[in-house]
């Protein structure tokens, strides 16, 4: 007799999830010698332990603490790049500017990037059919709680000048409900962080507006200033040229505004 299974509104666990996490861990330790001490089997066991046999709407940050402990990593606190709704460009940037780090350049972020996972209460099975959607089902689901936990820790670790890449093509360039707006902004430590510098990425070729004057950017500035952190903002009018100039700073065309 088939057992009744909860149907959630979101997509199910990414296929071959355990193998993917293990494989990513192996690859990460290969590429990053400073993380060679990590036991990938223990990492997988801790990851699995955070959500297996638990109700997928009842996950807590505490569930992820064993994983957080195993994935503890020191990144240069003054080289942190946050992003909101513009992940691909942020990752392209840190692939070129190797001394800067997004969350997904850390072990834990790398393991989980673009994956979905959830379990079921009282069974050791992974649910490959459906997982809770943040809006339609519940916010305390395994994926959302994971990203909230690692994002908070990442922001707490930041110091000096922290950069954030924002998508200038969106109606809300700064969105209070994004992970950046709801978690990271509020966990930057004013005693360590001097400045938050926003890079607003333009989408259109002919877009010469100063998007740093956008009302949502002003809202971000207000939130940051109230937290006793300085705020600065730059328009990146030509993201393609911006990346090219990061790769080749000596290029003659890279002295003009990008």
């Amino acid at each position: 007799v088939p057992r009744w299974r909860q149907q959630w509104s979101g997509p199910g666990t990414t296929k071959r999830f355990p193998e993917t996490v293990l494989a990513r861990c192996v690859k990460y330790t290969e590429i990053h010698p400073e993380m060679r001490h990590v036991d990938c089997q223990s990492v997988w066991d801790a990851f699995k332990g955070a959500f297996i046999s638990k109700h997928p709407c009842n996950i807590t940050e505490e569930d992820y603490q064993p994983l957080m402990k195993l994935g503890t990593q020191t990144v240069p606190c003054n080289k942190i790049l946050l992003w909101s709704r513009i992940k691909d460009l942020a990752h392209q940037f840190t692939q070129v500017q190797r001394d800067m780090f997004t969350l997904e350049d850390t072990l834990l972020g790398y393991l989980a990037d673009d994956l979905t996972w959830c379990g079921e209460f009282n069974t050791s099975k992974i649910n490959y059919q459906s997982c809770p959607d943040w809006r339609k089902d519940c916010s305390n689901n395994p994926v959302s709680v994971f990203w909230k936990t690692v994002s908070r820790r990442f922001a707490e670790a930041a110091c000096d000048v922290v950069h954030v890449m924002l998508n200038g093509s969106r109606s809300k360039i700064f969105d209070k409900n994004s992970t950046f707006g709801s978690v990271e902004v509020h966990n930057l430590q004013p005693e360590k962080v001097q400045t938050l510098e926003a890079w607003v990425i333009h989408g259109g070729r002919e877009d010469s507006r100063d998007l740093c004057q956008d009302p949502t950017i002003k809202e971000l500035e207000s939130i940051i200033s109230k937290r006793n952190i300085q705020f600065s903002c730059k328009n990146i009018y030509r993201p393609d040229k911006f990346l090219q100039c990061v790769k080749n700073p000596e290029d003659s065309s890279c002295t003009s505004e990008i």
């Epitope: 293990l22 861990c25 036991d39 089997q41």
Partner: nanobody, 122 residues
Framework: EVQLLESGGGLVQPGGSLRLSCAAS????????MSWVRQAPGKGLEWVSG????????YYADNVKGRFIISRDNSKNTLDLQMNSLRADDTAVYYC???????????????RGQGTLVTVSS
């Protein structure tokens, strides 16, 4: 190029011991889980034992638990299998394999060596 070279096989009497070794090269040994699998004459492949990349976690098939011990030396890129209380049904070609690890049901294997023959007979 990944290379896994097993050694230490041979003929041993029931109740005896044997130590198999595997020399690994061509990859970052300390990043990979390692395992031993075997194939008895006329039978399919059977997973025997596995060890995580840092040696923190070890796993054994039920029929070898308490008799076999898997170990690794990441400084020398070697994997060992100490086999005690050997029985006739342990007779097989033993292969060393590199992989990603164990998810509770499946051992994820990437590469396998050429194997070494263990014969348990009086």
């Amino acid at each position: 190029e990944v290379q896994l070279l097993e050694s230490g096989g041979g003929l041993v009497q029931p109740g005896g011991s044997l130590r198999l070794s595997c020399a690994a090269s061509g990859f970052t040994f300390s990043s990979y889980a390692m395992s031993w699998v075997r194939q008895a004459p006329g039978k399919g492949l059977e997973w025997v034992s596995g060890i995580s990349n840092r040696g923190v976690n070890t796993y054994y098939a039920d029929n070898v638990k308490g008799r076999f011990i898997i170990s690794r030396d990441n400084s020398k890129n070697t994997l060992d299998l100490q086999m005690n209380s050997l029985r006739a049904d342990d007779t097989a070609v033993y292969y060393c394999a590199s992989g990603k690890g164990w998810d509770g049901n499946t051992w994820y294997e990437d590469y396998r060596g050429q194997g070494t023959l263990v014969t348990v007979s009086s």
